[in-house]
């Protein structure tokens, strides 16, 4: 019965200076960490792993490397040009025994469309994945292989949040013991059957995802089988009972008034840090109205920002957020009208999100200009549309067929967009580059590890 309650995997999340540079503030970085963890928490909590239910995640600690840490010799992630394998190795060289998993988030453009990398768990004899403790490996270094990394950049473009959330779920899926999906049952997006194909592939698909298809944020039966075996054997080693908020993780959780981290991280005049005694930590200091850790509408002087102050930039699909004067949270932004063009005219706004394809503006559906014979590969990075449920009409926006809608304008996919039926991503030259799902893996194996570890790392 005790094991049934041990359902929470505690995370250590670090972000490098490039991630900070892209998001701009500690608060924005923490919001990103929070949204990623919430996303995977929802996915795993709603999945029944062969009777093991309610698997959840909690951030135990965060470390945000700011641009000031770019030159800090103690910051292992300070180097500008690191390949994905080396980046994962730098994370693994730290001791992460206190955590179920330890991740680093970055904003780097790794080669060949790689969005993440992680060690794969196994039910027994494994080196890697959840709960793995630091030990000495054949290259003479101590390593923690309960690790992974993700990046939010691909071919020079930033991936949409939904794709980044799925990338995180995918890499954590490896840590939990799932290899990539294979076989017809677990890769329906590759099916010739239109009914199956339209729901897309599952989380552990080896190549590209758009994040908006029905299966994209679900685990396949293949993954569930593998993950449940690992959970059965490993979760008692490091999972904890869920419930209590963790003061010091930088996130304001239920039961906390504020959370500015531990004393070495807390730059907040408004909140008692996590090193304070039990009755004070993560509480507002006397006479303080709010803490910046609660949200962007609180000043460094611990007062709510005035009514007219901007707390969120205008985006393609939503107007700017404006503080309301009585809460630290940034109120929801008003959405721009549905079918407003967004993402450089390749998509349209739906309910304040850049979510639909530009095709939808004209009652059409987006399709993949995939070439069965390989002749028309120049169109693989065009936005292509078809009449609803009629793939025979699939053609580029720049085609004769869709002239009355697009006036001969060929709309190209953004670099980093999935192409050729999710087999690859578009690069900056509008070439569809196939994803080599196991490339970095092979290189890392060759470089440092002995043969018995070869099976345990994956993108």
């Amino acid at each position: 019965t005790t094991s049934a309650e041990k359902n929470t995997c505690q995370l250590y999340i670090q972000t490098d200076h490039l991630f900070f540079k892209y998001y701009g503030t500690r608060e924005a970085v923490i919001a990103q960490i929070s949204s990623h963890v919430k996303a995977i928490d929802t996915i795993y909590q709603t999945t029944d792993f062969s009777g093991i239910r309610n698997i959840s995640f909690m951030v135990k600690r965060i470390r945000i490397n700011t641009t000031a840490d770019e030159k800090d010799p103690t910051n292992p992630f300070r180097f500008p040009n690191i390949g994905v394998e080396k980046f994962l190795e730098l994370n693994s060289e730290q001791n992460h025994d206190d955590y179920c998993l330890a991740y680093v988030f970055t904003d780097r453009d790794f080669d060949d469309g790689v969005l993440g990398l992680a060690w794969v768990g196994a039910p027994s004899g494994s080196s890697g994945g959840i709960c793995e403790k630091s030990k000495l490996y054949s290259d003479g270094k101590k390593k923690s292989l309960n690790t992974g990394i993700i990046t939010v950049q691909n071919y020079g473009s930033h991936v949409p949040p939904k794709v980044s959330h799925i990338t995180f779920a995918h890499e954590v899926g490896h840590n939990f013991g799932s290899p990539h999906d294979s076989g017809t049952e677990c890769t329906p997006g590759e099916s010739k059957n239109l009914g199956q194909k339209e729901n897309g592939n599952y989380i552990m698909y080896a190549r590209a995802t758009s994040g908006d298809k029905l299966n994209n944020n679900k685990f396949s039966l293949c993954s569930i089988r593998n993950i449940s075996q690992v959970l059965e054997k490993k979760r008692n080693n490091c999972f904890v009972e869920s419930g209590q908020p963790i003061c010091g993780n930088g996130m304001v959780e239920q039961g906390e008034e504020c959370d500015c981290g531990y004393s070495d991280q807390c730059k907040d005049e408004c909140c008692f840090d996590a090193n304070q005694p039990e009755g004070r930590k993560c509480k507002l200091k006397p006479g303080k109205q709010c803490s910046p850790s609660q949200g962007p509408c609180c000043t460094a002087q611990c007062a709510f920002k005035s009514k007219s102050e901007k707390c969120r930039d205008d985006s393609d699909c939503a107007r700017e957020g404006i503080c309301n004067g009585f809460t630290a949270l940034c109120p929801a932004s008003d959405p721009k009208p549905n079918f407003t063009d967004c993402n450089r005219h390749t998509q349209v706004c739906i309910n304040g999100q850049c979510a639909g394809s530009i095709c939808e503006k004209y009652g059409l559906e987006e399709c993949t200009c995939a070439s069965s014979d390989g002749k028309d590969d120049k169109e693989l990075c065009h936005v292509c549309c078809m009449k609803k449920m009629d793939p025979s009409t699939c053609a580029s926006t720049g085609s004769v067929q869709w002239s009355r809608h697009f006036s001969g304008r060929t709309i190209t996919l953004q670099p980093g967009s999935p192409c050729n039926d999710f087999r690859g991503y578009c690069d900056v030259f509008m070439r569809c580059r196939l994803v080599d799902a196991d490339g970095p893996l092979a290189r890392l194996k060759k470089a440092i590890f002995s043969p018995e570890l070869y099976e345990n790392i994956a993108e």
Partner: nanobody, 120 residues
């Protein structure tokens, strides 16, 4: 390289007519889709009409339907646009374009354009 040269543009009174021509440099054009597009100052390019290689299939923008007629002479390698009942809104630079043999082909070659001005 296919060269497309438009002619026949000019200044015309509202209600008047004009006939635009587009001469293609190569014979291969006879099997290809061809079309007319236009761009008014400060506006995006707009589709006007297209015609298939054998002339059997045509399509028009709603704004010109019933007033404009697209045709082609495959012997002379020329595309035409007969415009009548012209309106000031029709003022634009008119471009002809060539695509491939199929309706799914993309528009690959464009002319330099000819100016049409309709005065009220």
């Amino acid at each position: 390289e296919v060269q497309l040269v438009e002619s026949g543009g000019g200044l015309v009174q509202a209600g008047g007519s004009l006939r635009l021509s587009c001469a293609a440099s190569e014979r291969i054009f006879s099997t290809y889709f061809m079309g007319w597009f236009r761009q008014a100052p400060g506006k995006e390019r707009e589709f006007v009409a297209f015609i298939s290689g054998n002339g059997g299939s045509t399509d028009y923008a709603d704004s010109v339907k019933g007033r404009f007629a697209i045709s082609r002479d495959n012997v002379k390698n020329t595309l035409y646009l007969q415009m009548s009942s012209l309106k000031p809104d029709d003022t634009a630079v008119y471009y002809c374009a060539v695509a491939g043999r199929q309706i799914k082909s993309t528009w690959g070659y464009w002319g330099q354009g000819t100016q049409v001005t309709v005065s009220s």
